[in-house]
Interface confidence: medium
């Protein structure tokens, strides 16, 4: 990679891309935008899906963490020939189908949707798109929109989680590269470390969870720290503090030495979780330590 910013978060990322007739001469720019962005999400626990829409929505690449499949998915994406109408809601339907399926399989992984379109959606199409985006949200997704050229920012603010979740690209398709850094920063939710990573058995502790994007939740009230103890019991705790780069969470009281708690974060009251490889372990502490 080029040493640019990267995201270490473990979640499910869906690209929903406009391939209607109006993007015919700009598909290369859309492709390179997605390719650049895809290579910056580098967690082995991150899964990705490519969905395109015009007069219907098509899942070009199903959700996968396999980097070889993602490479092949990008190759398929490059070959897309745009044409047809802007049925954005069809793209959201394809994402919701996958989210619903994953939830039904017992995976409660957080979902992030990045939807890109270039045109204003006419009355019915806007209504359908907003409805389907809400359905994705109800399944736990965070929705971002990228608007290029002739988009309606007010519409996109309704389809996305909020106006802060909209990335306007006013200078045409060639300017897409310019928002990679900001979209990565805003859409990335990652857990990087926990301090302390070792706690005393049987004692109360608070843990500072270091990371990024914790204030990206639609409602900071719904952020939770989750501790999966010895790969079995899961305890959720509301944080004392929710800041963009850290959470301050009460750690569960782990009674025995050698117990392990894997750390996850939910942005939606436990509907789904950002996974990490951060582990908190217990040790024996004497009275003086």
């Amino acid at each position: 990679e080029d040493g640019g910013p990267a995201c270490y978060g473990g979640f499910d990322l869906y690209f929903i891309l406009d391939k209607s007739g109006s993007v015919l001469h700009h598909w290369n720019e859309i492709y390179y935008f997605v390719e650049q962005l895809a290579h910056r999400f580098i967690s082995p626990q991150l899964r990705m899906s490519f969905i395109v829409f015009s007069t219907r929505g098509t899942t070009l690449m199903k959700l996968t963490e396999d980097r070889e499949q993602i490479r092949q998915g990008l190759e398929e994406l490059q070959k897309v020939l745009p044409g047809g109408d802007t049925y954005m809601h069809e793209g959201f339907e394809r994402a919701s189908e996958q989210i619903y399926y994953e939830n039904s399989q017992g995976y409660r992984t957080a979902s992030v949707i990045i939807a890109l379109t270039d045109g204003e959606l006419h009355e019915d199409l806007f209504f359908y798109s907003e409805r389907e985006a809400n359905r994705s949200r109800d399944l736990g997704a965070i929705v971002y929109c990228v608007g290029v050229k002739d988009f309606n920012e007010t519409q996109l603010a309704r389809i996305a989680d909020s106006k802060d979740h909209v990335f306007p690209v006013n200078d045409g398709f060639q300017a897409l590269q310019g928002i990679i850094h900001s979209i990565l920063k805003k859409s990335c939710i990652e857990i990087l470390a926990a301090e302390p990573s070792t706690i005393c058995a049987g004692e109360s502790f608070q843990v500072v969870v270091r990371g990024n994007g914790f204030r990206h939740a639609r409602n900071v009230d719904r952020v939770l720290c989750s501790f999966k103890i010895n790969d079995s019991v899961t305890l959720n705790e509301k944080p004392f503090a929710v800041e963009d780069t850290y959470l301050l969470c009460p750690a569960p009281i782990l009674k025995e030495v050698g117990m392990k708690a894997a750390l996850q974060v939910s942005m939606n009251d436990g509907l789904s979780f950002i996974s990490s490889s951060v582990i908190i372990t217990t040790t024996h502490c004497s009275d003086g330590s």
Epitope: Q206, V208, N236, E237, K238, F240, V242, L248, P250
Partner: antibody, heavy 115, light 109 residues
Framework: QVQLVESGGGLVQPGGSLRLSCAAS????????MSWVRQAPGKGLEWVSL???????YYADSVKGRFTISRDNSKNTLYLQMNSLRAEDTAVYYC?????????WGQGTLVTVSS | DIELTQPPSVSVAPGQTARISCSGD??????VSWYQQKPGQAPVLVIY???NRPSGIPERFSGSNSGNTATLTISGTQAEDEADYYC???????????FGGGTKLTVLG
């Protein structure tokens, strides 16, 4: 709707003990951190103690070692056991639903420490 | 431990904008909540996480946080807004929840 009702306040001599209770209703009590906040007569608010949903406990330096916070999730009740009371502990004690903000408060119970 | 400093009092004419500040060295790192307390009543949360308004709180209440200062703004102040206002934040090295000293808002007239 959320309701928090404190009880157990009263007059106590310096060095004495008192146990405050806070009965909670209208929300899933065991999912929330809970806190005690006090206000001395004519003064500002002071955080006293907090217990997380998983029963981890935290105290302000001014009460550490003297006060104990606890909860009984089966009774939807929060407690504050106050020992070795001092004149400066005189205050209205509020129970509040907590976390990084106090979004619901009880009406408070007055604790007076005086000989 | 963090310390939050508020002006003891602020006066405003009805219909005007009241601004109450809350300053502290660590405020740039932490979000701030604001509480309104009327005489003989329990405090009420009016703003949390710098600028979020709980349901039921009028839109004239807003919050911001920049530099070393968080600000509670009440636009179109009404007589019923006369109360004590407290800011509250926390420390990232302990769960200590800290309150400012409080500001008495007087609505003139």
């Amino acid at each position: 709707q959320v309701q928090l009702v404190e009880s157990g306040g009263g007059l106590v001599q310096p060095g004495g003990s008192l146990r405050l209770s806070c009965a909670a209703s209208g929300f899933t009590f065991n999912s929330y951190a809970m806190s005690w906040v006090r206000q001395a007569p004519g003064k500002g608010l002071e955080w006293v103690s907090l217990i997380s949903s998983g029963s981890s406990t935290y105290y302000a330096d001014s009460v550490k070692g003297r006060f104990t916070i606890s909860r009984d999730n089966s009774k939807n009740t929060l407690y504050l056991q106050m020992n070795s009371l001092r004149a400066e502990d005189t205050a209205v004690y509020y129970c509040a639903r907590a976390g990084f903000k106090f979004d619901n408060w009880g009406q408070g119970t007055l604790v007076t420490v005086s000989s | 431990d963090i310390e939050l400093t508020q002006p003891p009092s602020v006066s405003v004419a009805p219909g005007q904008t009241a601004r109450i500040s809350c300053s502290g060295d660590s405020i740039p790192n932490y979000s701030v909540s604001w509480y309104q307390q009327k005489p003989g009543q329990a405090p009420v949360l009016v703003i949390y996480a710098d600028s979020n308004r709980p349901s039921g709180i009028p839109e004239r209440f807003s919050g911001s946080n920049s530099g070393n200062t968080a600000t509670l703004t009440i636009s179109g102040t009404q007589a019923e807004d006369e109360a004590d206002y407290y800011c509250q934040s926390y420390d990232n090295t302990s769960p200590d929840l800290v309150f400012g000293g409080g500001t008495k808002l007087t609505v003139l007239g």
